[in-house]
């Protein structure tokens, strides 16, 4: 019995075209994704395949101004409209709080909303129970197909799930879940799910009963040939793991942003044994024709968008000075005003030991691609952000050592004078550079804000000890030259827009007046 | 090399049947399309109907349904267009088209020769 | 069913030339278009699928456009070979629809 499996994850957002990169579709003949075009190639694999399941592996929130405006109405709405067949939270799922995930979209989604490893508890259990699942039994032409579905558990410091959500260790929790399909005659069994490649590929290993895992949140490209566009295999597709009872467990993940639709055909025995498993994914590039109806309806929901664009989300009283004269060489108070809303944020208080998870926030000032006058009234508008922050990257939350930061710090000013990006603006962090010095030993004083504190303050940066930072996610990925970053982070998550953390911040503050304080010097 | 080889031309009479032939080669036969399309005499082109020989699905123009059945034999990697009675009016050049639904090439990028029909009594 | 109306029929033309046929669609049939030539007593070749790209193999000199509704095949520079019939075909819905050809000669 032969079982088609589409699959996409973390979408974030991306319900429009998007240019080869994932950012805003600029030129329309190579352009990428969008739903309408998904919609077109699901549609001619439905019609030529008799066993095809459609699924997401979490993490369609967060990541435009469609999730800015709509809050999760767009994913249930088009979800819907593409006939998804079932989904798992992802932790983005999280970011407008329980309720703006239930409204949205757990109410209104006419497919099952799977995880497994979290539990609800208090007055919300019984508000929640019923509207996400740990499994759901799919018939599938014939046959039926047990979907199990699980989340990082890391989501309560990368979102916003409240105190009446527990989530568990994944494998602990898929196991009984398993088990009780196998009592149920269910024997092909998907895990779909939402905690990076490792976890996705240690649930293949270790849960007893998993035939396929279909993963998220590590926006990991596999394929097996010549890759298509710029995304570089980590692995080919499908990644088999050979599970502790000696099975051959296909795992998979379809990279991100609506780019590549995942295209994974098993084949089963009567036992529900997997006996061969091959695909790729489908790259959805602008010859793959837009669903002309589903198009017409994005058209329809955009209006929404344009008027939004425009609208004042706060005000500024000082002039946001954004220019490359000052972020490429000081500090800057635009600079200041991003990573303060990067940390605000993050704001997790998970523990009583720490009054936050995380205090340090670095941006590179070549990110930084606008003022704002405050002479326009103090208006601030989404469309002021976007060509501040118009590359439409996240802020994400990473692992390093203290090590890792020194030698951040000391490629911010290697070539200092240029004009170039790399010089970083700060939040939590104190630096005084000497620019008398040779590149490489240029920093002369790197003190960092504590988190296990009452009363925050500045220490000395440790070289062995472990911080937690928030920065764009163009650094994290070694973009401007930062290499030590990406080659040496312990542990990264994708966080939030970059336009929606800072006009976030703008709402919730009204009236906004950053000053240049002090937190970079030079002696 | 990718090929499809359609069997050779056909003389009937009204009201015979006949199956016609179109052997791929060269691809996974069972991951493509296949279509049959029409040419009478001196005219252009009517897609009939299609069949997808992986899973057997077959969708036919409303035109065709019922005067003709598509059919495939994945084993051999041959799919077939038949009549049960033939008419005057099937005398026409018949192709195979092979269409890619896996990948963008959104039309049919190799076709057979064609199969010549002549019916008449 | 989509009616894709091809225009003109026929056309006469020099080598050298540059011709544009066009192809509208009775409905919104997105980029799914193809063209295709067609020689005397042989089977049709693809040369542009979803509107605007070349298939393998196909020369320089055609080019294809449109979406929606109104497609265009172009050949820059007409050569002797070029001569043939031209058919559109949407491939959006089915039944999967052809124009009704445009026949190139030599003027």
């Known amino acids: 019995w032969e079982l088609t499996i589409l699959h996409t994850n973390d979408v974030h957002s991306r319900l429009e075209q998007t240019s080869e990169d994932s950012s805003k579709c600029v030129n329309a003949s190579r352009c990428m994704g969008g739903v309408a075009r998904l919609f077109t190639k699901v549609q001619q694999i439905r019609r030529a395949e008799p066993n095809v399941l459609l699924l997401d592996a979490g993490d369609q929130y967060q990541g435009t101004i469609w999730f800015t405006v709509y809050k999760g109405a767009e994913v249930a709405h088009f979800m819907n409209a593409l006939r998804y067949d079932a989904m798992a939270l992802g932790n983005h799922e999280f970011d407008n709080g329980v309720e703006g995930l239930i409204e949205p979209l757990l109410k209104e989604a006419k497919f099952p909303i799977l995880s497994a490893n979290i539990k609800a508890k208090g007055p919300l259990a019984s508000q929640i129970s019923g509207l996400y699942l740990p499994y759901k039994v799919l018939p599938v032409g014939d046959e039926v197909v047990g979907i199990v579905g699980y989340t990082s558990k890391e989501t309560p410091f990368l979102s916003n799930p409240g105190t009446n959500l527990v989530f568990e260790d994944e494998i602990t929790a898929l196991q009984p879940e398993v088990d009780k399909l196998k009592t149920l005659n269910v024997n092909k069994i998907i895990a779909l799910g939402h905690s990076g490649f490792e976890m996705d590929k240690l649930i293949a290993q270790k849960v007893r009963g998993v035939d396929v895992v279909v993963g998220g949140h590590s926006n990991t490209f596999l394929y097996t040939g010549n890759p298509p566009s710029k995304e570089v295999p980590a692995g080919k597709y499908p990644f088999i793991v050979t599970s502790d009872d000696g099975r051959k467990v296909p795992v998979v993940q379809a990279y991100a942003f609506g780019k590549y639709l995942g295209y994974l055909k098993i084949e089963f025995d009567e036992r529900g044994n997997v006996i061969s498993s091959h695909g790729n994914p489908i790259l959805l590039n602008s010859s793959i024709p837009e669903d002309p109806s589903i198009k017409a309806d994005i058209n329809k929901w955009r209006i929404k968008l344009d008027n939004y664009s425009t609208q004042e989300l706060g005000k500024t009283i000082v002039y946001l000075d954004g220019s490359s004269q000052s972020c490429r060489f000081r500090e800057c108070n635009m600079g200041n005003l991003i990573c303060d809303a990067m940390i605000n944020n993050n704001l997790r208080h998970t523990d009583e030991m720490f009054w936050n998870h995380v205090s340090m926030c670095i941006l590179n000032g070549g990110g930084i691609r606008s003022p704002i006058d405050e002479r326009n009234n103090g208006t601030i508008t989404w469309e002021n952000l976007a060509a501040v922050l118009p590359f439409g990257g996240t802020f994400d939350l990473v692992q390093l050592k203290g090590s890792t930061l020194k030698k951040a710090f000391e490629h911010s000013v290697h070539r200092y004078g240029q004009s170039t990006g790399e010089f970083l603006q700060v939040g939590g962090i104190h630096v005084v550079y000497d620019l008398s010095r040779k590149p490489g030993d240029r920093v002369v004083k790197l003190d960092v804000l504590c988190t296990k504190c009452r009363v925050p303050s500045y220490d000395p940066l440790k070289m062995d000890e472990v911080y937690k930072v928030i920065l764009p996610n163009f650094l994290a990925n070694g973009g401007d030259g930062f290499q030590m970053i990406k080659d040496e982070l312990l542990r990264h998550d994708s966080g939030d827009q970059d336009i929606n953390v800072v006009s976030t911040y703008i709402s919730k503050m009204k009236v906004i007046y950053p000053a240049v304080e002090g937190r970079i010097k030079f002696s | 090399e990718v090929q499809l080889v359609q069997s050779g031309a056909e003389v009937k009479k009204p009201g015979e049947s006949l199956k016609i032939s179109c052997k791929g080669s060269?691809?996974?036969?069972?991951?493509?399309?296949l279509s049959w399309v029409r040419q009478m005499p001196g005219k252009g082109l009517e897609w009939m109907g299609e069949?997808?020989?992986?899973?057997?699905?077959?969708y036919y123009n409303e035109k065709f349904k019922g005067q003709v059945t598509i059919s495939a034999d994945k084993s051999i990697s041959t799919a077939y267009l038949q009549w049960s009675s033939l008419k005057a009016s099937d005398t026409a050049m018949y192709y195979c088209?092979?269409?890619?639904?896996?990948?963008?090439?959104?039309?049919?990028?190799?076709w057979g020769a064609g199969t010549t029909v002549t019916v008449s009594s | 069913a989509i009616r894709m109306t091809q225009s003109p029929s026929s056309f006469s033309a020099s080598t050298g030339d540059r011709v544009t046929i066009t192809c509208k669609a009775s409905?919104?049939?997105?980029?799914?278009v193809a063209w295709y030539q067609q020689k005397p007593g042989k089977a049709p070749k693809l040369l542009i699928y979803?509107?605007?790209y070349r298939y393998s193999g196909v020369p320089s000199r055609f080019s294809g456009s449109g979406s929606g509704t109104d497609f265009t095949l172009t050949i820059s520079c007409l050569q002797s070979e070029d001569f043939a019939t031209y058919y559109c075909?949407?491939?959006?819905?089915?039944?999967?629809?052809f124009g009704g050809g445009t026949k190139l000669e030599i003027k």
């Open positions: 069949i997808y020989p992986g899973s057997g699905n077959t």
């Open positions: 979803s509107a605007s």
């Open positions: 409905q919104d049939v997105s980029t799914a």
């Open positions: 075909q949407q491939h959006y819905n089915t039944p999967y629809t």
């Open positions: 088209a092979r269409y890619d639904y896996l990948g963008s090439s959104y039309g049919f990028d190799y």
């Open positions: 060269g691809y996974t036969f069972t991951s493509y399309g």
